[in-house]
């Protein structure tokens, strides 16, 4: 591999590296390919110590257009020199390359969550994996957005320790018999574009008598 190949830009692939459920997922799309590959192989090396390209075992001859690199790419400081090969049968159709630096190239997908509406509060249950590697924490904070009648409120729950295991947050002081929508996302310490989850909505039941909710805030 030439790490300083001339300044050409006619790459035939578009790559995206995402943190999905706290796993590093590299996905790709093909541009202008008349023949669709039957399978792909992903290879990489590290820039600071360039060696022969290493095939990613679970992404060798794969038919998927994504690859889980959590167990391979452990450093947020390294640049990973990556090559994607596309095949049709035994014929190599193309080879695309790109360098990835997780600390700034990573985008953060929202975690899975559920909501349960009560008379004057909503329980938001956010699902995190049971174990999350320290290097995949990325100085992230969880944001829960509450929307009702055009008003958006941001909640930033304080999570003790790592984002791991399930986490419940109570949005309280709500108005009975009102429709509320909730979105969750992970916010980076910098103003990186966030990926918000689709809204989940609930119509709170009408109030019988005033209910009090212990806030988890």
């Amino acid at each position: 591999i030439s790490y300083d190949s001339p300044d050409y830009t006619d790459e035939s692939c578009t790559f995206k590296i995402s943190l999905r459920n706290f796993r590093s997922i590299l996905s790709w799309e093909l541009k202008n390919h008349s023949i669709v590959p039957t399978h792909y192989t992903l290879l990489y090396t590290i820039m600071s110590k360039p060696e022969d390209l290493k095939v990613v075992k679970n992404c060798a001859n794969t038919t998927r257009s994504f690859c889980d690199l959590t167990d391979e790419w452990r450093s947020t400081h390294e640049a990973y020199v990556t090559v994607l090969e596309g095949f049709s049968g035994n014929t190599t159709l193309f080879s695309c390359s790109h360098n990835f630096w997780l600390a700034i190239d990573m985008s953060f997908e929202p975690p899975e969550f559920e909501i349960v509406g009560f008379t004057n509060h909503i329980n938001v249950m956010v699902k995190f994996p049971s174990i999350v590697e320290e290097e995949l924490q990325f100085d992230l904070s969880l944001v829960i957005e509450e929307q009702s009648e055009g008003i958006v409120k941001k909640h930033k729950p304080e999570i003790k320790g790592n984002m791991s295991g399930n986490f419940t947050y109570i949005i309280d002081k709500l108005i009975p018999n009102t429709n509320y929508c909730v979105s969750v996302y992970l916010e980076h310490s910098d103003e990186q574009a966030v990926i918000k989850s689709p809204l989940k909505c609930t119509l709170l039941p009408p109030g019988q008598e005033s209910e009090s909710a212990e806030s988890a805030k």
Epitope: Y3, D4, S5, P6, D7, Y8, T9, F15, M47, S48, R74, S75, T76, H77, E78, A79, V81, S97, H98, N99, W101, A103, I104, D105, M106, S107, E134, E135, D190, E191, Q192, A193
Partner: antibody, heavy 117, light 112 residues
């Protein structure tokens, strides 16, 4: 060979903004991030921030948030940094540098900014 | 932020003699990936900085082997075995383990 060509010196009035550029050549521009570094006599070298040339994601030194804005134009292989509300403290040399991961390797020749009324 | 402290401020050396610059960080620079992102730059008079050493001890291509980098954790050293005239300038250490990246104040190498 790898080159980072920065825009020429700037003489600007206090309170205005200035946008300086850094054009990469001799390598595939979107494979390397671009950092910006401030050099003053008083404070030696200070890291302003870094931008991903592929995605446009940024990391700023908290100290320069609101002062510096980094952008990138992939089509011209050029990174930009805009400095707002200039004061005499901003009269220094600004460098761009490229990096693969945390390792800055090549630096631009520097852009001198002078703020004077 | 990590504070990088370089000593001495100025180093006056006779050509052919050795030189040594110290760099101390306020926090360990060992990353969870097992690497230490401590680097050295040289800025010759009137020029932009040029990378000499990265990851504590790896020499950049074209850098003469009279330069050596060593250290771990918080204490690092740059040594020049025999100083040559082209070595004059300001040497900076900088760390890329923790955001924001930070630089030492610089050590000016003068030729006696």
């Amino acid at each position: 060979q790898v080159q980072l060509q920065q825009s020429g010196p700037e003489l600007v009035r206090p309170g205005v903004s200035v946008k300086i550029s850094c054009k990469g050549s001799g390598y595939r521009f979107t494979d390397y991030a671009i950092h910006w570094v401030k050099q003053s006599h008083a404070k030696s070298l200070e890291w302003i921030g870094v931008i991903s040339t592929y995605y446009g994601n940024t990391r700023y030194n908290q100290k320069f948030k609101g002062k510096a804005t980094m952008t990138v134009d992939k089509s011209s292989s050029t990174a930009y940094m805009e400095l707002a509300s200039l004061t005499s403290e901003d009269s220094v040399i600004y460098y761009c540098a490229r990096s693969g991961g945390s390792l800055m390797d090549y630096w631009g020749q520097g852009t001198s900014v002078t703020v004077s009324s | 932020d990590i504070v990088m402290t370089q000593t001495p401020l100025t180093l006056s050396v006779t050509i052919g003699q050795p030189a040594s610059i110290s760099c101390k960080s306020s926090q360990s620079l060992l990353d969870s990936d097992g690497k230490t992102y401590l680097n050295w730059l040289l800025q010759r008079p009137g020029q932009s900085p040029k990378r000499l050493i990265y990851l504590v001890s790896k020499l950049d291509s074209g850098v003469p082997d009279r330069f050596t980098g060593s250290g771990s954790g918080t204490d690092f050293t740059l040594k020049i075995s025999r100083v040559e005239a082209e070595d004059l300038g300001v040497y900076y250490c900088w760390q890329g383990t923790h955001f924001p990246y930070t630089f030492g104040g610089g050590t000016k190498l003068e030729i006696k």
